[in-house]
Amino acid sequence: KKVVLGKKGDTVELTCTASQKKSIQFHWKNSNQIKILGNQGSFLTKGPSKLNDRADSRRSLWDQGNFPLIIKNLKIEDSDTYICEVEDQKEEVQLLVFGLTANSDTHLLQGQSLTLTLESPPGSSPSVQCRSPRGKNIQGGKTLSVSQLELQDSGTWTCTVLQNQKKVEFKIDIVVLAFQKASSIVYKKEGEQVEFSFPLAFTVEKLTGSGELWWQAERASSSKSWITFDLKNKEVSVKRVTQDPKLQMGKKLPLHLTLPQALPQYAGSGNLTLALEAKTGKLHQEVNLVVMRATQLQKNLTCEVWGPTSPKLMLSLKLENKEAKVSKREKAVWVLNPEAGMWQCLLSDSGQVLLESNIKVLPTWSTPVQP
């Protein structure tokens, strides 16, 4: 008996071939001997089966001695043995229809679980293997689960169902809803304008939800909500914003926030959360602000940074084109009685400059000038 695997919702062609290469009488029946379809001369005739409106054949193939049964919009319950009667012979074809679906939705938040469920006909014992877009293989029976979805899991999952040495392939498009970056850090000199960007790692036609940026300033004892906003069909509208600082927000995606001035009291860490309509859970992106200030007070030249810096970052003070006068893994450095000239305060990571502030030290009879 020939075995054919089909996919739920798909169309399948069950073949039946006669030795004579011409149009002759044929019939297709199911295992209960109920006629599905056949021919009367050149006309297609249909029987009283449940397949009536979904069964068809191909007239142009009859003249070649081929009498296919074509079943559209396959259902699991179409799984059966189909019998083709032609030339006093009977050809049996066993059709097994499988379905593979993702739990609830194919748009899932980062960190959530994906469950794939296999629908199969009674009496079948299929095995399933799925390959994620990043090449990770998972195997299972009726259900397959992947916990803690990552951004790289977005894309087409290819699942192969094996039964009776035959296979059928399913492709499921999964979208992991997340920000492009889990965390970002912005380095700014005091007084500079700060731009925070929160690009999404996915595109959907309609995006609706609400969000908030909570800020924990290094100098503050508790965190504070800086801004709340709504998102409707990719349009951003601000609901509430603090007076200090007075953030501005872009009206279009990607989510974009502007802080008019980088000040030491704003240095710290923020957490932008985005709750999407019809989704449980929230998207998160951490953002950090490091602020640098270089000052000269009487005979003391000081450079300070505020905000979340790694212990391996180096803070240096150096006179332009000269070796660093002072270089420490600390958040403040200073030079007493600095020589006149252009001084540079540098925050660097393994030799790469992250932030730089220049201050001009004038001869002792003058006051300092900050460019």
């Epitope: 798909d10 169309t11 006309f43 068809d56």
Partner: antibody, heavy 115, light 107 residues
């Protein structure tokens, strides 16, 4: 919704080979036959040939010696090659889905053969 | 090959008119016939299949009839969007063949 998107070279010189590809999305690929049809400017429709997912083909005898139809099931795509083209092969070429009748069509590709 | 002869090759009509197009198959094709509508610069669209079955989404003013050799497409009340070219096609045997087309023009 089933969609057929086709592409290929639009300008050929006589004796060259016409090459077109059609990508199918949004529906079943396996249970149907996938056809190529052409229509010379201001004229009627001519069926070129067809293929199914397993590579079984049927061609118009008038073109059979010059036609190659192939299928790539991994991409849900099928292709047409027509060799030794002449000015008489200038036409709008369509891909279409067929069981007995053509229910979904590609947007068409105008192929001009000119020296 | 099965020859499909469509008549007339063109017809002038007004909005609201009843329009009839015929297609003759030689030899006969039982009911293995379809009708298509084609507008300039567009691909044909299936209107009627199996001689008389209306394709999903096609307005009910279109109807088909006939069996064997003679087939008819009727537009009961012509609408402005119906001015187009109409083709018949047989699916009885290879090669699949089309009629020469009937252009429905505005009077």
């Amino acid at each position: 919704q089933v969609q057929l998107q086709q592409w290929g070279a639009g300008l050929l010189k006589p004796s060259e080979t016409l090459s077109l590809t059609c990508a199918v999305s949004g529906g079943s690929f396996s249970g149907y036959y996938w056809s190529w049809i052409r229509q010379p400017p201001g004229k009627g429709l001519e069926w070129i040939g067809e293929i199914n997912h397993s590579g079984s083909t049927n061609c118009n005898p008038s073109l059979k010696s010059r036609v190659t139809i192939s299928v790539d099931t991994s991409k849900n795509q099928f292709s047409l090659k027509l060799s030794s083209v002449t000015a008489a092969d200038t036409a709008m070429y369509y891909c279409a889905r067929v069981l007995n009748f053509f229910d979904y069509w590609g947007q068409g590709t105008l192929v001009t053969v000119s020296s | 090959d099965i020859q499909m002869t469509q008549t007339p090759s063109s017809v002038s009509a007004s909005v609201g008119d009843r329009v009839t197009i015929t297609c003759r198959a030689s030899p006969g094709i039982s009911n293995w016939l379809a009708w298509y509508q084609q507008k300039p610069g567009k691909a044909p669209e299936l209107l009627i299949y199996a001689a008389s079955s209306l394709q999903s989404g096609v307005p009910s003013r279109f109807s088909g009839s006939g069996s064997g050799t003679d087939f008819t497409l009727t537009i009961s009340s012509l609408q402005p969007e119906d001015f187009a070219t109409y083709f018949c096609q047989q699916a009885n045997s290879f090669p699949l063949t089309f009629g020469g087309g009937t252009k429905v023009e505005s009077k």
